[in-house]
């Protein structure tokens, strides 16, 4: 028998520095977690103790903090090289700055193979990107070889900016011939490493003949066997065992997100490459693990540029940006409109001639807007200003909801109106009218939404049975501020870009902004 240790990360999302327990900015260092310096300590400890070790990343290193905003992927290549990753799969967020924003900082600089079998380049891009990412890689480990085959969410064109010269194929259809090639190369230990979410990971384990292990990402799935060490609630045991269609037991793993855990899976193979046993657990990277001093010193060196950036002007406002709780928790506020407009703008994807865009709607809990911005400071808006407005380090995500769920959400928005509670919704691409004289749960008297399948966008009444795409904070997607109906009833959820980054990019693009209060939210006569 031959034993392999798979160390894995996924959805690190720019958390190069240690973070608080909820993966936001580290405040009390003695209670902070993760970060590449701490990760390196643990990886090195395992490499020294065990003979056959692979360090793999399942995508979405890009996007999530000011590190990515400033360094645009160069930080990912630099620190992943320093940690000596063995391979990485492309995630959807790796395309956030377009194909060029992937090729130059990451693909050309990574000292490890970057993989995806279901992304096919065409046109002029084909020769430019040739060899910079691969469908699979055969890695020598000890006296054996291990095949790693990559995959990426086929939804990427709707979630990011891969352009028109990359085709995202069905994962299973694309993976099978590559796995067959590996078998033809007499490679009998095969890991599928990719970024399509836990449901697809399980399907790959079930359907792709010859895959021995699946290491996934995208859905931030936390798996654990035994008592979990932190706040994350396991979605299942680690590893999660899937019985393949040809009767094999295939371990599937994922390691939550944000570099908080290091996935640790031990696999025992027989001489024919069959999995005999698999066991392990994610390792919580808490403060009991010291940060590696040399990596930490490097982080501190790179950090200097971030501090300078946060005080630079992004753009100007010529109006007061009202982000006060007195406004945003009671009525339409122009800060809410600005943020929602930025959220929609960030999700412009013309992937179908029938649609002017794939999504037109935004909702945003008023309680998530934490500060106004005064225009009387020469109109200057900085990253620092935006960090005061959006201090929680969240993301603006894409969900699919039925009209009936949206109606419930808007009822919840005003079910206890007047108490300055955070659930009051700010909107974009939606016109809502409330009648507060009616009983809670029946206060929405009009709810019109902007069409997407139209050449001239206009507002139509919400249809209860129709499925709509909506951009919203991850906080709401996870049922925050009492929006349990969104969490329970959402049909699809894809994590998006860092909230501050979305707004800062929009302001930089617009240069001068002047958001107004324009009647998106109304109260029917006599009730307000």
């Amino acid at each position: 028998a031959w034993e392999l240790t798979i160390l894995h990360t996924n959805d690190v999302h720019s958390r190069l520095e240690q973070t608080s327990e909820d993966s936001s900015k580290c405040v009390n260092a003695s209670r902070c977690m993760g970060g590449v310096a701490r990760l390196f300590t643990k990886v090195q400890q395992i490499r020294r103790a065990e003979p056959n070790v692979l360090l793999l990343d399942a995508g979405d290193q890009y996007q999530g903090t000011i590190w990515f905003t400033v360094y645009k992927g160069a930080e990912v290549a630099h620190f992943m090289n320093a940690l000596r990753y063995d391979a990485m799969a492309l995630g959807n967020h790796e395309f956030d700055n377009g194909v060029e924003g992937l090729i130059e900082p990451l693909l050309k600089e990574a000292k490890f193979p970057i993989l995806s079998a279901n992304i096919k380049a065409k046109g002029p891009l084909a020769s430019q990107i040739s060899g910079l990412y691969l469908p699979y890689k055969v890695l020598p480990v000890g006296d054996e070889v291990v095949g790693i085959v990559g995959y990426t969410s086929k939804e990427t064109p709707f979630l990011s900016n891969p352009g028109t010269n990359l085709v995202f194929e069905d994962e299973i259809t694309a993976l099978q011939p590559e796995v067959d090639k590996l078998k033809t190369l007499n490679v009998n230990k095969i890991i599928a490493l990719g970024h399509s979410g836990f449901e697809m990971d399980k399907l790959i384990a079930q359907k792709v003949r010859g895959v021995d292990v699946v290491v996934g990402g995208h859905s931030n799935t936390f798996l654990y066997t035994g008592n979990p060490p932190s706040k994350e609630v396991p979605a299942g045991k680690y590893p999660f065992i899937v019985t393949s269609d040809d009767g094999r037991k295939v371990p599937v793993v994922q390691a939550y997100a944000f570099g908080k855990y290091l996935g640790y899976l031990k696999i025992e193979f027989d001489e024919r490459g069959n999995v005999i046993s698999s066991h392990g657990n994610p390792i919580l990277l808490n403060s009991s693990i010291p940060e590696d001093p040399s990596i930490k010193a490097d982080i501190n060196k790179w950090r200097i540029k971030l501090d300078n950036y946060s005080t630079q002007e992004l753009g100007k406002t010529i109006v007061y940006l009202d982000g006060s709780s007195q406004s945003c928790r009671f009525r339409e506020c122009n800060m809410g409109n600005l943020i929602c407009d930025a959220m929609i703008n960030n999700n412009l994807r013309h992937t179908d001639e029938m649609f002017w865009n794939h999504v037109s709607m935004c909702i945003l809990n008023g309680g998530g807007i934490r500060s106004p911005i005064d225009e009387r400071n020469n109109g200057t808006i900085t990253w620092e200003n935006l960090a005061a407005v959006l201090p929680f380090g969240g993301t603006f995500d894409l969900v699919q909801l039925k009209g009936s769920t949206l109606k419930k959400a808007f009822e919840h928005s005003v079910h206890r109106y007047g108490q300055s509670t955070g659930e009051f919704l700010q909107v974009g691409g939606i016109h809502v009218v409330y009648d507060l004289s009616r009983k809670p749960g029946d206060r929405v008297v009009k709810l019109d939404v902007l069409c997407t399948k139209c050449r001239v966008p206009s507002y139509d009444p919400l249809k209860m049975d129709e499925v709509y795409k909506v951009i919203l904070p991850n906080f709401l997607a996870n049922g925050g501020d009492g929006f349990q109906m969104i969490k329970d009833e959402l049909l699809r959820h894809d994590s998006g870009d860092q909230d501050i980054n979305v707004v800062s990019t929009y302001i930089s693009k617009m240069k001068v902004i002047y958001p107004a209060v324009e009647g998106r939210i109304k109260f029917s006569t006599g009730s307000h």
Partner: antibody, heavy 118, light 107 residues
Framework: QVQLVQSGAEVKKPGASVKVSCKTS????????IYWVKQRPGQGLEWIGW????????KYNEKFKGRVTITADKSASTAYMELSSLRSEDTAVYYC???????????WGQGTLVTVSS | DIQMTQSPSSLSASVGDRVTITCKAS??????VAWYQQKPGKAPKLLIY???TRHTGVPSRFSGSGSGTDHTLTISSLQPEDFATYYC?????????FGQGTKLEIK
Amino acid sequence: QVQLVQSGAEVKKPGASVKVSCKTSGYTFTNYYIYWVKQRPGQGLEWIGWIYPGNLNIKYNEKFKGRVTITADKSASTAYMELSSLRSEDTAVYYCARDDNYAWFAYWGQGTLVTVSS
Amino acid sequence: DIQMTQSPSSLSASVGDRVTITCKASQDVSTAVAWYQQKPGKAPKLLIYWTNTRHTGVPSRFSGSGSGTDHTLTISSLQPEDFATYYCQQHYSTPFTFGQGTKLEIK
């Protein structure tokens, strides 16, 4: 473009050692295998071994084990093959080659002639 | 080790001819066979891998076929620059092994 440039011809006495270098450029050194291949005068090709610079894993053809040492210097993007206890049958052209994606030899160095003669 | 036996060891042909070189493996190598061209004093050049996939820049007159133990390289219409020695190689398992070569000469 991908290039592999080998060190120059060597003449060695039996029992001596020789170290052939293979300097690469035009691609990321750590991401591809470097293979070494032997070709005796007027003869066919023999695979000596590989090094994968990413994790410095080395594999030798059993036939060459013991006298051959393959190494790499990541910072210089250069691979080396050292052959010790030279004998006359080691007289050959030694090639380094790079894979495309494992196991076939897509790009070759120009070859280094090693002559073993007393 | 897997033995690769090429035939013929040499052959004479004329410009425009169709030429076939065969390679027999001592055991099943599936479709894991590559073909190389070597000219005197030069390094070998990859022509084909995976039995029938042409390497970048290789003219379409070169084609490969086969599976299991029997593999073939075909040059559909010989050009003057094609006179060289050709080697097959199995990339199925280590140690990777080559055929002894086929020398293609001008008739």
